[in-house]
């Protein structure tokens, strides 16, 4: 690996994540004489480490009869929190990890919050409301993003290797200018994530400086390096 | 930090030479492409060529080919650039530049006049 | 060899307007470069390396973006130190090669 110029930069063109909650003001949709079940699935990245905060549908308090949090998490049994108005009770059914929380007591705010969250996060996350009108629903398909750590050397004359390493989903790795390229390879890892390594050569001498592109639903960076003179060449035309 | 030094000023006379110095410190001083470029009072930036300390590796743009020679010194980490047969046209600031473009040096005026 | 072309040449602009100035590689070519801040009597000053990344120091009114093959340096909210000459380098092919140069001046 070569001491070659090495500047990170990250792109002002990423693309803006999920706010850490989807909980907002709507309006009642129940009505009294309504026996419609409503049903909302909502799929929705979150980056890991940060907060997340998943909603219930905007159901008034007093029509309430149980609320229930059905998390269905790959590789584990289907976990259950649950909140029973008539008796003020809550009740939990295979849950296991302490990061899934009320996000305070459930007669307050039947809201789900991940605090942080992980790469094991991913699954589907369903609530339940329970009303003399029927049963509402509101799930989340949470896709955990992971940043992929982004590498760049140049490994022999005028081939250089860029890598997006462990990110979720897999990254995109594009080049400036266009190189004579080797398939790009994907490793997948036992967590989910992915490392993508693009490696590219340069045969006109006039290309100064290559730049690795790394695209990624957390946000876009760009890595650039000054190829290395070849071995052996000493003086050349521009 | 990065430092790239350069004398602030070169006084010589129409048809002579000059050897402009740069002297870098702060980083692997074989591992980057040193840089030159030329610019006229009131005017653009041209590039003039580049030297590889490492391997004395030099590329030079078509209108700079028989005008600059680039040479290094590995012991005082030092790039030099003889001018030759220097013209009022050849009057201007030169500048060395290191790291991608991203450190230059002060840049040294050169006049030339009788 | 890549021909950069800067517009505009120059401009004139009031405290606290947003300002913004172009650079476009000649027959679409794909490139990367930098923006530079030069004051007279100054060595220039690397403001945006890359096409968007903003230097240590430099304030958070400089942005630099790119879309294409076209690249735009915005500084959002003008004030009076950045009355100065801004120009672009293409670092990609040899020889490397600069913009005209957009000279700011504060009306």
């Known amino acids: 690996q070569s001491n070659n110029s090495l500047m990170l930069q990250t792109s002002k063109e990423n693309h803006t994540l999920a706010s850490n909650s989807l909980c907002m003001d709507e309006k009642q949709i129940t009505q009294n004489h309504s026996k419609v079940l409503a049903e909302v699935n909502i799929s929705w990245p979150v980056q890991m480490a940060r907060n997340a905060v998943l909603c219930c549908p905007p159901i008034e308090f007093r029509n309430l009869i149980v609320i229930t949090w059905e998390i269905i998490l790959r590789g584990q049994p289907s976990c259950t929190k649950s909140y029973r108005k008539e008796t003020n009770e809550t009740k939990e059914t295979n849950c296991t990890d302490e990061r899934i929380t009320w996000v305070s007591t459930p007669d307050q705010n039947s809201d789900l919050q991940i605090h942080p969250v992980a790469i094991t996060h991913d699954g589907y996350y369903r609530c339940i409301m329970a009303t003399p009108d029927g049963n509402f629903h509101r799930g989340y398909h949470l896709q955990v993003l992971v940043t992929p750590e982004v590498t760049l050397f140049e490994s022999r004359n005028r081939t250089a290797v860029c890598k997006a390493v462990a990110g979720k989903p897999a990254a995109q790795i594009s080049w400036i200018p266009a190189g004579d390229c080797a398939p790009t390879e994907q490793e997948y890892w036992g967590n989910g994530t992915v490392t993508v390594k693009s490696t590219c050569h340069w045969e006109g001498h006039n290309v100064s400086t290559v730049t690795c592109h790394v695209s990624h639903l957390t946000g876009n960076k760009s890595l650039y390096i000054e190829l290395l003179p070849v071995p052996g060449a000493k003086k050349s035309a521009k | 930090q990065v430092q790239l030094q350069q004398p602030g000023s070169e006084l010589v006379r129409p048809g002579a030479s000059v050897k402009l110095s740069c002297k870098a410190s702060g980083y692997t001083f074989t591992s980057y492409w040193m840089h030159w470029v030329k610019q006229r009072p009131g005017q653009g930036l041209e590039w003039i060529g580049n030297i590889f300390p490492g391997s004395d590796t030099t590329n030079y743009d078509e209108k700079f080919k028989s005008k600059a020679i680039m040479t290094v010194d590995i012991s005082s980490s030092t790039v030099y650039m003889h001018l030759s047969s220097l013209t009022s046209e050849d009057s201007a600031v030169y500048y060395c530049?290191?790291?991608?473009?991203?450190?230059w040096g002060q840049g040294t005026l050169v006049t030339v006049s009788a | 060899d890549v021909q950069m072309i800067q517009s505009p040449s120059s401009l004139s602009a009031s405290m606290g307007d947003i300002v913004t100035m172009t650079c476009q590689a000649s027959?679409?070519?794909?490139?990367?470069l930098h923006w530079f801040q030069q004051k007279p009597g100054k060595a220039p000053k690397l403001l945006i390396s890359g096409g968007s990344n903003l230097e240590d120091g430099v304030p958070s009114r400089f942005s630099g973006s790119r879309y294409g093959t076209d690249f735009t340096l915005t500084i959002s909210s003008l004030e009076d130190e950045d009355m100065a000459t801004y120009f672009c380098l293409q670092f990609t092919y040899l020889p490397w090669t600069f913009g005209g140069g957009t000279k700011l001046d504060i009306k």
């Open positions: 530049i290191t790291y991608t473009g991203a450190y």
């Open positions: 027959q679409g070519t794909n490139i990367n």
